[in-house]
């Protein structure tokens, strides 16, 4: 006979559960699907993660997002987890939000990113929600700084990237400081492929940076080079 | 060829001073920064501190309180001194030579690559 | 003080590749040293200015460095090149030599 009165709960469908901390009035719900939309835009060395929530939400309102990063070198074509390597606008674990920035992307290097979505019955089941986007990294490859002379009170650098990238380039940027002295550097703008850094100090030690500014932003920063200039017994401009 | 050769006492109390020193033989003596490094039993490599021919030096932040490195221009020789010991300084001390003169033609190397080490002195210090 | 991360251990089957990272903030502007060590013995240069080799050493070492991370790669890898590897920089805003923390390659 017809109990006179309903289940005070019922046993969950297949697919469908509780997680432990739900009450027992609760509806069974599911684990949701996959985010909907993934887009990864690449600027320089950072890409822009953007999702829509899973069309199927399991019938929960819990979701969270996890981002995991995987990088390919192009040459072998081997993979590995890069979370070592990379910086996330906020960890990437947990998300509730659906965007993230991943930065300190290295050039030429093929980066795949997975999003996955999960609610409060996913650990329950062993299958996954999730959806990858891949991006190249195509920022400028860093200068390559020569000293080409120096005199008491100058140094003149110039420096070269290959010339497929160079008309990406609309600026280069030349940070220079005196070796010791942290607290304060210098700036030069130039379209050029060389500059003369003057009103130096003689028989000093200079630490002078190169990089390439692109509409994308800022390509890699060439490495931090030490240039002196001549101590004051040394003669006149000469080259190296 | 150059060749580093090291020598100092091995053993040590609590409190003592480390005395080291690493004679030059061969190249160009006063074209470098010279390097202390050590090794405490089955971990890493630290640096120590590196001195030129004239006197100038850098130390590790981590020890500047200590030490203190000097040169010998006549004898081709630097010489470490680590004060106030501890069992904390055991470990194998080596000197080590940079790959490259420190500065040629304006292009300097600061913190270059160690192609040449010392044969290393085990120093332990012990009540 | 600038920080070098290295993983504390990397193994690999012989004649596979092995691939010892050193992690350190924009490491890709300075020029990263490698060093392998054997029980008992002074460090030896295997790789110097990222990715060149001093004379002596095999091609199957070789380096790159960009970004945040620099590799140091041993190719066909054999019994004898199990040691301790350990990456360097001279970190130019402290003006002081920093290694990192050291790889164990174990050879399966």
């Known amino acids: 006979l017809p109990s006179p009165e309903g289940a005070t709960s019922c046993e969950c469908e297949e697919g469908f559960f509780r997680a432990p901390q739900d009450p027992a009035s609760m509806p069974c719900t599911r684990p949701p699907s996959a985010p909907h939309y993934l887009t990864a835009v690449g600027m320089g060395a950072k890409v822009e993660l953007r999702w829509t929530p899973p069309q199927d939400s399991g019938g929960r309102e819990d979701i969270v997002y996890s981002v995991t990063c995987e990088q390919c070198w192009p040459e072998s074509g081997e993979c590995g987890p890069c979370e070592a390597s990379v910086r996330y606008s906020e960890p990437p674990h947990g998300l509730t939000r659906t965007s993230v920035t991943v930065s300190d992307l290295e050039p030429h290097m093929n980066y795949t990113f997975t999003v996955e979505a999960r609610n409060g019955v996913s650990g329950l089941v062993t299958s996954r929600s999730f959806r990858t986007a891949s991006v190249s990294i195509n920022q400028t490859e860093p200068p390559k700084v020569r000293l080409e002379g120096r005199s008491t009170t100058s140094l003149s650098v110039s420096w070269s990237i290959p010339p497929p990238q160079q008309s990406r380039v609309w600026k280069y940027e030349v940070t220079y400081r005196k070796k010791g002295d942290s607290n304060s550097y210098n700036v030069r703008r130039t379209e050029g492929f060389s500059v003369t850094l003057d009103d130096l100090a003689p028989d000093t030690t200079y630490l002078v940076q190169v990089q390439a500014l692109t509409q994308e932003g800022q390509g890699a920063g060439s490495k931090v080079h030490e240039f002196q200039t001549l101590s004051p017994e040394g003669s006149g401009n000469l080259a190296v | 060829q150059v060749q580093l050769q090291q020598w100092g006492a091995g053993l040590l109390k609590p409190s003592e001073t480390l005395s080291l020193t690493c004679a030059v033989y061969?190249?160009?003596?006063?074209?470098?920064?010279w390097s202390w490094i050590r090794q405490p039993p089955g971990k890493g490599l630290e640096w120590i501190g590196e001195?030129?021919?004239?006197?100038?030096?850098n130390y590790n932040p981590s020890l500047k309180s200590r030490v203190t490195i000097s040169v010998d221009p006549s004898k081709n020789q630097f010489s470490l001194k680590l004060t106030s010991v501890t069992a904390a300084d055991t470990a194998v001390y080596y000197c080590?030579?940079?790959?490259?003169?420190?500065?040629?033609?304006?292009?300097?190397?600061?913190?270059?690559?160690?192609?040449?080490w010392g044969q290393g002195t085990m120093v332990t210090v012990s009540s | 003080s600038y920080v070098l991360t290295q993983p504390p251990s990397v193994s690999v089957a012989p004649g596979q590749t092995a691939r010892i990272t050193c992690g350190g903030n924009n490491i890709g502007t300075k020029n990263v040293h490698w060093y392998q060590q054997k029980p008992g013995q002074a460090p030896v240069l295997v790789v110097y200015d990222d990715s060149d080799r001093p004379s002596g050493i095999p091609e199957q070492f070789s380096g790159s460095n960009s970004g945040n991370t620099a590799t140091l790669t041993i190719s066909r890898v054999e019994a004898g090149d199990e040691a301790d590897y350990y990456c360097q920089v001279w970190d130019s805003s402290s003006d002081h030599l920093v290694f990192g923390g050291g790889t164990k390659l174990t050879v399966l």
């Open positions: 061969g190249g160009s003596f006063s074209d470098y920064y």
């Open positions: 080590a030579k940079p790959f490259r003169p420190h500065c040629t033609n304006g292009v300097c190397y600061s913190g270059d690559a160690f192609d040449i």
């Open positions: 001195i030129n021919h004239s006197g100038s030096t």
